[in-house]
């Protein structure tokens, strides 16, 4: 076949995705290496073709796009999951061509499993908050363009394995988390799920994030007060010392 | 399509003990927690306890912590509950049910209905 | 452990009434509360879920409300195949507890 720009492989957009769980994936061609985007090369005649190499397999197959459900598709650069299964791992080829012009990039994909409590492989983006610095916010990252503003999905919050309620100064706010004051005690990983109909089928998103409080910008700082119960008001204090004894940081029992 | 299929019904001796399994197809098993749900006529419906297949992790309603215990088996995507010295008062239909963290149950199985004899 | 009351137990309903049934939580679960339909012979199925939201493929007849302590599930239309028995459940803390269930009958 005729010359095709080929990118290599940008393990820079080394991209990980829960099992059994939407994903949406642009092409990093637009994004990254050309100087157009999807819809001027559509204009001009140019067509993008998917194509991808299962884990520990040389072969290139192209994807199939007539699964039960659509399980795959794609919709303009963007590549879907409806949802992703653990075998969909692999690395995975945008090309984009006509009689006179082609273009690639690989990129690989991860698909990972996550345990009980929201623990897994997956690397996390670490957001800062400052020490006693006032309302700070937190919000569910990476959920645009999974679903239109008309969905009112429904979204829940945990730190660790605990479900965040009666915590005294972490306030769930739909897809913000609010920390009216961030102490020591915040800091951990918190998740959010988010929960939204398609098509007359339900989808979930999980993300996690870390939080890590800092000194605060002035560089001066509260006295941090390292007691890991910190936020939890007496009712939190009573689930989470309730029928076994587990401790704060032992993230292998799920209570709430 | 999410499909649980649970094992046929049982009639057992009062002190035996019971297991009955739930096998799960069309999502990832080890990726949601299994419930199980007793239901006596008249009784309504009462939460025993679930398990996350991933990692065997289990939550107990207290008052079937003696009674119920569960286990899973991923390379049969199927969860399991034992029930132990039962009585009378164990008579009951049993449902596995799925749920993604959230704590509601969104496919439930056909239930098993199990008879304890004296 | 969270005492979900339900009213009533039983409801004579005629084809096309509203229909509206009452659960109360023996103390604060937030919004989440989920509720369901069994009709004889089978198993539950999820209709509600976080108190107003509609479990997909649920027809637009069946609303819910609350939060706090009180909630309310309506049928604005009841169509036959709607006779069955149905269960809230609060999925705000463990152990999870449900209504002792409304049945609805004909008249």
């Known amino acids: 076949s005729e010359r095709c720009d080929d990118w290599g492989l940008d393990t820079m957009r080394q991209i990980q995705v829960f099992e059994d769980e939407p994903a949406r994936i642009k092409c990093p061609l637009f994004e990254h290496f050309l100087k157009f985007n999807y819809s001027t090369a559509h204009s001009a005649g140019l067509t993008l073709i998917w194509y991808w190499t299962r884990q520990d397999r040389d072969l290139e197959e192209p994807i199939n796009f007539r699964l039960p459900e659509n399980r795959i598709s794609k919709e303009k650069d963007v590549l879907w999951f409806r949802p992703t299964l653990l075998n969909d791992t692999g690395n995975y080829t945008c090309m984009l061509r006509n009689t006179t012009y082609c273009s690639k990039v690989a990129f690989p994909l991860e698909v990972v499993q996550k345990d009980s409590c929201f623990n897994s492989p997956m690397k996390l983006p670490v957001h800062k908050l400052y020490i006693e610095y006032g309302i700070q916010r937190i919000t569910c990252p990476n959920v645009d363009g999974y679903f239109p503003s008309s969905v009112k999905p429904t979204i829940t919050w945990y730190m660790g394995c605990y479900k965040i309620q009666n915590f005294n100064n972490v306030i769930p706010e739909g897809m913000n988390l609010s920390f009216l004051i961030a102490l020591i005690s915040n800091n951990g990983n918190y998740t959010c799920v988010v929960t939204y109909p398609e098509n007359g089928r339900t989808f979930h998103l999980t993300r996690t994030l870390t939080v890590k409080v800092v000194g605060s910008p002035g560089g001066g700082s509260g006295k941090p007060i390292p007691n890991p119960l910190l936020g939890l008001d007496s009712t939190g204090l009573n689930d989470i010392f309730e029928a076994q004894k587990i401790e704060w940081h032992e993230h292998h029992h799920h209570h709430h | 399509q999410v499909q649980l299929q649970q094992s046929g019904p049982e009639l057992v001796k009062s002190g035996a003990s019971v297991r009955i399994s739930c096998k799960a197809s069309?999502?990832?098993?080890?990726?949601?927690?299994m419930n199980w749900v007793k239901q006596r006529p008249g009784k309504g419906l009462e939460w025993i306890g679930r398990?996350?297949?991933?990692?065997?992790?289990?939550n107990y309603n207290g008052k079937f912590k003696d009674k119920a215990t569960l286990t899973a088996d991923k390379s049969s995507s199927t969860a399991f509950m034992q029930l132990s010295s039962l009585t009378s008062e164990d008579s009951a239909v049993y449902f596995c049910a799925r749920d993604y963290y959230l704590f509601y149950f969104d496919y439930w199985g056909q239930g098993t209905t199990l008879t304890v004899s004296s | 452990n969270i005492v979900m009351t339900q009213t009533p137990k039983f409801l004579p309903v005629a084809a096309e009434d509203r229909v509206i049934i009452t659960c109360k939580a023996s103390q604060d679960v937030s919004n989440e509360v989920a509720w369901y339909q069994q009709k004889p012979g089978q198993s539950p199925k999820l209709l509600m879920y976080?108190?107003?939201n509609r479990y997909t493929g649920v027809p637009d007849r069946f609303t819910g409300s609350g939060s706090g302590t009180d909630f309310t599930f309506t049928i604005s239309s009841v169509q036959v195949e709607d006779l069955a028995v149905y269960f809230c459940?609060?999925?705000?803390?463990?152990?999870?507890?449900f209504g002792a269930g409304t049945k609805l009958e004909l008249k």
């Open positions: 976080y108190a107003s």
């Open positions: 069309g999502y990832a098993f080890s990726g949601s927690w």
């Open positions: 398990i996350y297949p991933g990692d065997g992790n289990t």
């Open positions: 459940q609060q999925h705000y803390s463990s152990p999870l507890t």
